[in-house]
Amino acid sequence: ESLGTEQRVVGRAAEVPGPEPGQQEQLVFGSGDAVELSCPPPGGGPMGPTVWVKDGTGLVPSERVLVGPQRLQVLNASHEDSGAYSCRQRLTQRVLCHFSVRVTDAPSSGDDEDGEDEAEDTGVDTGAPYWTRPERMDKKLLAVPAANTVRFRCPAAGNPTPSISWLKNGREFRGEHRIGGIKLRHQQWSLVMESVVPSDRGNYTCVVENKFGSIRQTYTLDVLERSPHRPILQAGLPANQTAVLGSDVEFHCKVYSDAQPHIQWLKHVEVNGSKVGPDGTPYVTVLKTAGANTTDKELEVLSLHNVTFEDAGEYTCLAGNSIGFSHHSAWLVVLPAEEELVEADEAGSVYAG
């Protein structure tokens, strides 16, 4: 049951885990106020070294910016101090606390606002745009298989309600610039591109602005194209095995293939004392191959029961698809039962079924 997760891993850049959305605070300060942000250690335990970050950039202490392990002070705040602040563990970069700070012309009311994605005019404060959920905007790289759909979002707020526009590679981006067009949802602060193609690769920037200022976020889109290839076999499989006479053995072979693979298990044999034919091709016997009701999962395991000395030798997992073949081999050594204890002491690699 791995589809969603795997697709997500393929499709997204790695990110530092952040706090739960409920842990984010929306704070409004008046121009000239002292911005004070406090971040106590989670669970009251030791905090370790921390770093304070504004809009993704580490804050440098100054006469106006006072940085402590659990507290940040910005004196004589101005519009430029609006933004997303976070306190992170220095070593892991894990976000411990997250604040969305707005500095307005009016004296601060002390009221926090809900972090909704929809724009709302509060009718009270006026101020520059700010991201409503800044902790969700850390990820900037999106890699997507061709023919799928991409959505970029920049949910923001401000008073008056800001406008949003989109750039591609620094230039105005409109529907006529791509086959299939684009879908804009201003109330959802989103840009949607259906059925992406390689020419959609690039940098997409949302610009959110009102008369008090503007903020922007740039995302990078990579569109992945698949080139067909022969099956890929997991390294180290099948693995060499040592078994005691009469025990059971399993060889495993993990196959990755775009095209439907055909899997076979072969055992190398000798014919008239020779392991290879005149053309250099090894002599083999087919032990297991696809049948009407055989699943790929079943074919990825070769089970040998009650092994005899004749079972010793080289085994090969052969996987083919419409592009080509791949194979990995492993050896089985069969020991007489009385050697079991001695061998186990010496090598620690004996399996007694």
């Epitope: 049951e1 791995s2 589809l3 969603g4 795997e6 697709q7 997500r8 393929v10 499709g11 997204r12 959920r133 969700r136 905007m137 990820k139 900037k140 999106l142 997507v144 298989p145 061709a146 023919a147 799928n148 759909t149 991409v150 959505r151 970029f152 979002r153 949910p155 949802r185 959802q188 949607v192 059925s195 995302y219 194209e225 698949r226 067909p228 990755y256 293939s257 775009d258």
Partner: antibody
């Protein structure tokens, strides 16, 4: 033009097996997924499972897990639904549908949308 | 699994009517909801994805809205070809699940 054509349906006894095929054309088979959805006579839609041929990853509904297997052959642009240990309650019209993802950095899930559907093939499990 | 509950299960309407179908999820599914139309003996057709995005080629009289647990499909002016059964479906988690359907019949 995107097209999906199912085949392989028919009458089968309980405990029997059947393999359905879904031949696709008109789109990049390795970039999107294929879902199987079934509809019992006079009933609603029930998702059966899906495959992303790109990496072969599959998901199944609990009701068919361990009995049904979805696979794909990208060289033939065809997806398959192998149905084993069939039961009377598996009687339905089986549809395959092209499935694409909506990738969105802002959220922690990938939404999957089934946009093109085949005409369906009827599977009847009866003794 | 997430349950999707549609209402009403059936409705009668006339050509030109405004029709609204609702769908409620048993838990928050964000905006990961699609709507499908199915006519007897035919395969379903995608109308709306991501709760409010009209799929290409679908007439603009169809619209979708909602987020979280409550979703709505609206047909602004019912046309003769719109008499069919409509299904909502969540794709927030695996397995995706469908509503039981709403049959729109001619009054």
């Amino acid at each position: 033009e995107v097209q999906l054509v199912e085949s392989g349906g028919g009458l089968v006894q309980p405990g029997g097996s059947l393999r359905l095929s879904c031949a696709a054309s008109g789109f990049t088979f390795t970039s999107t997924g294929i879902s199987w959805v079934r509809q019992a006579p006079g009933k609603g839609l029930e998702w059966v499972g899906r495959i992303y041929p790109t990496n072969g990853s599959t998901n199944y509904a609990d009701s068919v897990k361990g009995r049904f297997t979805i696979s794909a052959d990208t060289s033939k642009n065809t997806a398959y639904l192998q149905m084993n240990s069939l039961r009377a309650e598996d009687t339905a019209v089986y549809y395959c549908a092209r499935t694409y993802g909506i990738y969105d950095l802002y959220v922690d899930y990938t939404e999957y949308v089934m946009d093109y559907w085949g005409q369906g093939t009827l599977v009847t499990v009866s003794s | 699994d997430i349950q999707m509950t549609q209402s009403p299960s059936s409705l009668s309407a006339s050509v030109g009517d405004r029709v609204t179908i609702t769908c409620r999820a048993s838990q928050d599914v964000s905006t990961a909801v699609a709507w499908y139309q199915q006519k007897p003996g035919k395969a379903p057709k995608l109308l709306i994805y991501s709760a409010s995005f009209l799929y290409s080629g679908v007439p603009s009289r169809f619209s979708g809205s909602g987020s979280g647990t409550d979703f709505t499909l609206t047909i602004s002016s019912l046309q003769p070809e719109d008499f069919a059964t409509y299904y909502c479906q969540q794709s927030y988690t695996t397995p995706p699940t469908f509503g039981q359907g709403t049959k729109v019949e001619i009054k």
